[in-house]
Amino acid sequence: GSQWTDACLSHPCANGSTCTTVANQFSCKCLTGFTGQKCETDVNECDIPGHCQHGGTCLNLPGSYQCQCLQGFTGQYCDSLYVPCAPSPCVNGGTCRQTGDFTFECNCLPGFEGSTCERNIDDCPNHRCQNGGVCVDGVNTYNCRCPPQWTGQFCTEDVDEGNSGLNDIFEAQKIEWHENLYFQGHHHHHHHH
């Protein structure tokens, strides 16, 4: 009988398609958006009208397409009305305010900036870490990594003085340099003197 050969060994199928060998011949099963014997041809979905609604412009992409919507419409097919704050584009707890038919403004929480509040403001340029402390940025605050003999949020407390920390902030602990970093979240656990 004839020798069986695996026609898929040469990886003839392109663009992520699946190869199978049938009677010593390869057969490619294409992913959506590709065509041809080896799935080498990108289907231009934009040749078929009606993909993008409400006057949206069709943009062909490898294996897919994208609709660029006219002002006032949104969604994959430009089939939805655009409402600036629904859903809110503001992140990090920012509050969205509609400023026009198609415009919005994000009111950011303290510590964040950017048109959608996407950036955490670096608080270290204005830091006040004392006694050789090194600043580490937080959210609308900063923390200080203290050298071994100092502790507290701002490295103002002498470790050797025990628990004589600044009022309502910190409890002195003998912590190694690399661990001596006080985060704001700890505040709730500190007792009043």
């Epitope: 830091h127 006040r128 505040h187």
Partner: antibody, heavy 120, light 107 residues
Framework: EVQLVESGGGLVQPGGSLKLSCAVS????????MEWVRQASGKGLEWVAA??????????VYSASVKDRFTISRDDSKSTLYLQMNSLKTEDTAVYYC???????????WGQGTLVTVSS | DIQMTQSPSSVSASVGDRVTITCQTS??????LAWYQQKPGKSPKLLIY???RLQDGVPSRFSGSGSGTDYTLTISSLQPEDFATYYC?????????FGGGTKVEIK
């Protein structure tokens, strides 16, 4: 005993320049943040500029009102802090104090002050 | 910048009176607050740091309290040498900011 002594104040015309000095003694200069604070006659205290310590690479911060006009610097070999003031305005008229940031988030030592008068 | 609202701007009191001065900050300063005393023609003098810690050499009739955004300086029994102007200052971050001052005058 910690001591800070300012000098260099005087009368200068608007647009002019002046360099203030602050000679310090009684502590290791490079270990401390140093600040300039000013006070117009009959008014409150206004922070002007700061230079952090050696551990913080002697980094510098300015108030918005003097940024790009004033320059803070220090000479550790002379234990002296400086404030170079350029493009002076009448509103810069004040007593200028040099102070030490004592590692407590507070200014624990102050000089006697030097008067700067900007007038034509 | 952190805003400092100090009140009252002036207070008339007698020797032996208890005097209270308040300072409110526009954001949490984590007890990084100092109080200073200034007499006419003199440099400011540090009284309290860390909101409640008494600076060395300062009489115990001066005390500080508070946390977050609200702070208080108390003179328990006013002495003749205490008639002066008092300033609060936040040390949490630059730019350092001062309260407008409170003048303690003789009644």
């Amino acid at each position: 005993e910690v001591q800070l002594v300012e000098s260099g104040g005087g009368l200068v015309q608007p647009g002019g320049s002046l360099k203030l000095s602050c000679a310090v003694s009684g502590f290791t200069f490079s270990d401390f943040y140093m600040e300039w604070v000013r006070q117009a006659s009959g008014k409150g205290l206004e922070w002007v500029a700061a230079q952090r310590n050696k551990a913080n690479d002697f980094s510098i911060v300015y108030s918005a009102s003097v940024k790009d006009r004033f320059t803070i610097s220090r000479d550790d070999s002379k234990s002296t802090l400086y404030l170079q003031m350029n493009s002076l305005k009448t509103e810069d008229t004040a007593v200028y104090y040099c102070s030490r940031d004592g590692g407590k988030l507070a200014l624990d030592a102050w000089g006697q002050g030097t008067l700067v008068t900007v007038s034509s | 910048d952190i805003q400092m609202t100090q009140s009252p701007s002036s207070v008339s009191a007698s020797v032996g009176d208890r005097v209270t001065i308040t300072c409110q900050t526009s954001e949490d300063i984590y007890s990084g607050l100092a109080w200073y005393q200034q007499k006419p023609g003199k440099s400011p003098k540090l009284l309290i740091y860390g909101a409640s810690r008494l600076q060395d050499g300062v009489p115990s009739r001066f005390s500080g309290s508070g946390s977050g955004t609200d702070y208080t300086l108390t003179i328990s029994s006013l002495q003749p040498e205490d008639f002066a102007t008092y300033y609060c200052q936040q040390g949490f971050k630059y730019p350092l900011t001062f309260g407008g001052g409170t003048k303690v005058e003789i009644k």
